[in-house]
């Protein structure tokens, strides 16, 4: 008789999840010499240990500490790019501007990017059918707690000028409920971080409006200023040209603001 299985509202664990995590780890450590010492089997064991046999609504940051320890990585603290609701462009940017890093350019972010996972209480099985949805089921699920943990650590490590890419095509350019708004903003360290510089990315349509004047950006400025961090904001009116100019900064059309 098949055992009753909890039905959650979100999609189940990504197929071939263990193999994907292990393969990504191997690939990452091959590409990044400074992480060559990492034992990917140990990384997978620690990852698995964070959620296997545990109720997928009772995961804590503590559960991920062994994985965090194994994935400890030093990135230049003054070269951090945060993003909110505009992941693809942020990643395209760091692929070109190789000395800057998003969370997904670190080992732990790279391992988990775009993946879903969860287990079941008291069984060693991975649930490939469904996993808890953050809104409909519970916030302390394996995926949400993972990203909260790594995002907090990433923000805590930042220093000097921190950049954040924000999506100007959203109704809330800055959203207090996003990972950036709820975790990263509050974990930037005022004694280390001098300035948060927001890049507001305009959508495909041409526009001359200054989205740095948007009320949600003013709200972000207020939050940041209260934390004794300076705030600045730039419009990226043409993201395609912005990327092109990152690739070819000497191009004559790249002298003006983009």
């Amino acid at each position: 008789v098949p055992r009753w299985r909890q039905q959650w509202s979100g999609p189940g664990t990504t197929k071939r999840f263990p193999e994907t995590v292990l393969a990504r780890c191997v690939k990452y450590t091959e590409i990044h010499p400074e992480m060559r010492h990492v034992d990917c089997q140990s990384v997978w064991d620690a990852f698995k240990g964070a959620f296997i046999s545990k109720h997928p609504c009772n995961i804590t940051e503590e559960d991920y500490q062994p994985l965090m320890k194994l994935g400890t990585q030093t990135v230049p603290c003054n070269k951090i790019l945060l993003w909110s609701r505009i992941k693809d462009l942020a990643h395209q940017f760091t692929q070109v501007q190789r000395d800057m890093f998003t969370l997904e350019d670190t080992l732990l972010g790279y391992l988990a990017d775009d993946l879903t996972w969860c287990g079941e209480f008291n069984t060693s099985k991975i649930n490939y059918q469904s996993c808890p949805d953050w809104r409909k089921d519970c916030s302390n699920n394996p995926v949400s707690v993972f990203w909260k943990t790594v995002s907090r650590r990433f923000a805590e490590a930042a220093c000097d000028v921190v950049h954040v890419m924000l999506n100007g095509s959203r109704s809330k350019i800055f959203d207090k409920n996003s990972t950036f708004g709820s975790v990263e903003v509050h974990n930037l360290q005022p004694e280390k971080v001098q300035t948060l510089e927001a890049w507001v990315i305009h959508g495909g349509r041409e526009d001359s409006r200054d989205l740095c004047q948007d009320p949600t950006i003013k709200e972000l400025e207020s939050i940041i200023s209260k934390r004794n961090i300076q705030f600045s904001c730039k419009n990226i009116y043409r993201p395609d040209k912005f990327l092109q100019c990152v690739k070819n900064p000497e191009d004559s059309s790249c002298t003006s603001e983009i």
Epitope: R205, E206, D207, S208, D210, N235, Y237, S253, S256, I258
Partner: antibody, heavy 118, light 112 residues
Amino acid sequence: QVQLVQSGAEVKKPGSSVKVSCKASSEVFPTSYMSWVRQAPGQGLEWMGDILPNIGRIFYGEKFEDRVTITADKSTSTAYMELSSLRSEDTAVYYCAREAYGSILGYWGQGTLVAVSA
Amino acid sequence: DIVMTQTPLSLSVTPGQPASISCRSSQSLLHSNGNTYLHWYLQKPGQSPQLLIYKVSNRFSGVPDRFSGSGSGTDFTLKISRVEAEDVGVYYCSQSSHLPWTFGGGTKLEIK
């Protein structure tokens, strides 16, 4: 062909409010800013503010931001402009105008006369 | 706010003759995205304004080629190569480089 059809003329008392509507014929209504521009009798044009219906982003001219409310109903492709605390100097023709290209008002409604008189 | 100043206030032109209207802005209209958002509208008697020229020199669809625009920075010109009777009305320059969008005071074109 883009058409903007506005509501009819209104006569209002000082201190009251008026709400003017503007119905668009176009399927691109949600993704184009809709502006409101007014013209007092014998005077020039004055931009009041605009809205991007699909995400509800609104910009107001500083002169109007305390008294004007711009809204849009995507389901009916209709934009609205409500002006409160009316005074005699608000007597004007109020136009809605839709972008043809980014930040360029290419299509205009026929105008709605709002007369404010005691 | 950016102030747009038009000259002359009015002009009277014989059909077939050229006409020129000037527009000056209180600050540069060159936007940081590389565009200059200076436009020209015509408001014919009893009608709504209609777009003639956008971004300094681009004719809007259906606008006759006798209308042309030029200029940069803060100084702009609308030219009508050969005025026709249907060109009467008030011409407005407008900027949308900086919020709030602003309009010139208008230039009234009459036929002699």
